[in-house]
């Protein structure tokens, strides 16, 4: 549910939201680290209704959710949570 992508594209997010999304309505989360043409970290959330929203990385709820997902992934190996795609 949590993915990290390294991409050569510039910033994907034009607008960011801090609005809370319950976990049951999240399909997956994509993290784009800063660099490679974009000066900021970006978080893209796919909702269960197929819509996509960019989430403010400073939003407290997304930070908490990612921490929970990281902890869960480390305790449920070998299922990978972070997928790294190098262009």
């Amino acid at each position: 549910v949590l993915e990290v992508y390294y991409t050569s594209l510039r910033c994907r997010c034009v607008q960011e939201s801090s609005v809370f999304i319950p976990r049951r309505f999240i399909d997956r989360i994509q993290i784009l680290p800063r660099g490679n043409g974009c000066p900021r970290k970006e978080i893209i959330v796919w909702k269960k209704n197929k819509s996509i929203v960019c989430v403010d990385p400073q939003a407290e709820w997304i930070q908490r959710m990612m921490e929970v997902l990281r902890k869960r992934s480390s305790s449920t190996l070998p299922v990978p949570v972070f997928k790294r795609k190098i262009p």
């Epitope: 609005v19 319950p22 309505f25 909702k47 209704n49």
Partner: antibody, heavy 119, light 107 residues
Framework: EVQLQQSGPELVKPGASVKISCQAS????????MNWVKQSHGKRLEWIGD????????TYNQKFKDKATLTVDKSSSTAYMDLRSLTSEDSAVYYC????????????WGQGTSVTVSS | DIVMTQSHKFMSTSVGDRVSITCKAS??????VAWYQQKPGQSPKVLIY???HRHTGVPDRFTASGSGTDFTFTISSVQAEDLAVYYC?????????FGGGTKLEIK
């Protein structure tokens, strides 16, 4: 304009069942979860559960899983709630309410259906 | 289940006053909290979502804050039409749960 039109008041006997309807208009019915909420005379609101009209998937509050059954009829954009084995504890106003995909609270509510259980 | 506690069942205030209603969650709900207004004889209406975001068309005298377990809903200058019951609701985890409601009475 989004509207949720609920069926009229019900007076039923203990042990009986009742089916409440909620007809939606003004939006794509299949695209939004429909919630059901109970409001007893003590005024507290209780979430019964929700249904995804797109795939008929339901999530119930465990408290109501043996009491309520949620269904939809996509052809008429109508959500239904069946309540069974009714007792005086089930006397309440029942609301249908649409879940917002923008902010995940309930953004549109029906006018409520009053159910009175009495012999 | 997550219990949402509104400590005051009734609050009495005067037109023009500032009033704050509190809501406490029994466990961390992040910012997954909404506030609803229910006027006499009407259905509930969402005012605030995601703990602090005002819904479209809601007057700016209504504000809210909080995160984790403690939440506050404020009316900066109460109007006569604000006579209603106000409910908090968590939508962090199912079953979604509501506070017991706070009835705002106008003196």
């Amino acid at each position: 304009e989004v509207q949720l039109q609920q069926s009229g008041p019900e007076l039923v006997k203990p042990g009986a069942s009742v089916k409440i309807s909620c007809q939606a208009s003004g939006y794509a019915f299949s695209d939004y979860y429909m919630n059901w909420v109970k409001q007893s005379h003590g005024k507290r609101l209780e979430w019964i559960g929700d249904i995804n009209p797109n795939n008929d998937g339901t999530t119930y509050n465990q408290k109501f899983k043996d009491k309520a059954t949620l269904t939809v009829d996509k052809s008429s954009s109508t959500a239904y709630m069946d309540l069974r084995s009714l007792t005086s504890e089930d006397s309440a106003v029942y609301y249908c309410a649409r879940l917002s995909w923008s902010f995940f609270a309930m953004d549109y509510w029906g006018q409520g259906t009053s159910v009175t259980v009495s012999s | 289940d997550i219990v949402m506690t509104q400590s005051h069942k009734f609050m009495s205030t005067s037109v023009g006053d500032r009033v704050s209603i509190t809501c406490k969650a029994s466990q961390d709900v992040s910012s997954g909290v909404a506030w609803y207004q229910q006027k006499p004889g009407q259905s509930p209406k969402v005012l605030i979502y995601s703990a602090s975001h005002r819904h479209t068309g809601v007057p700016d005298r209504f504000t809210a804050s909080g995160s984790g377990t403690d939440f506050t809903f404020t009316i900066s200058s109460v109007q006569a039409e604000d006579l209603a019951v106000y409910y908090c609701q968590q939508y962090y985890n199912t079953p979604w749960t509501f506070g017991g409601g706070t009835k705002l009475e106008i003196k």
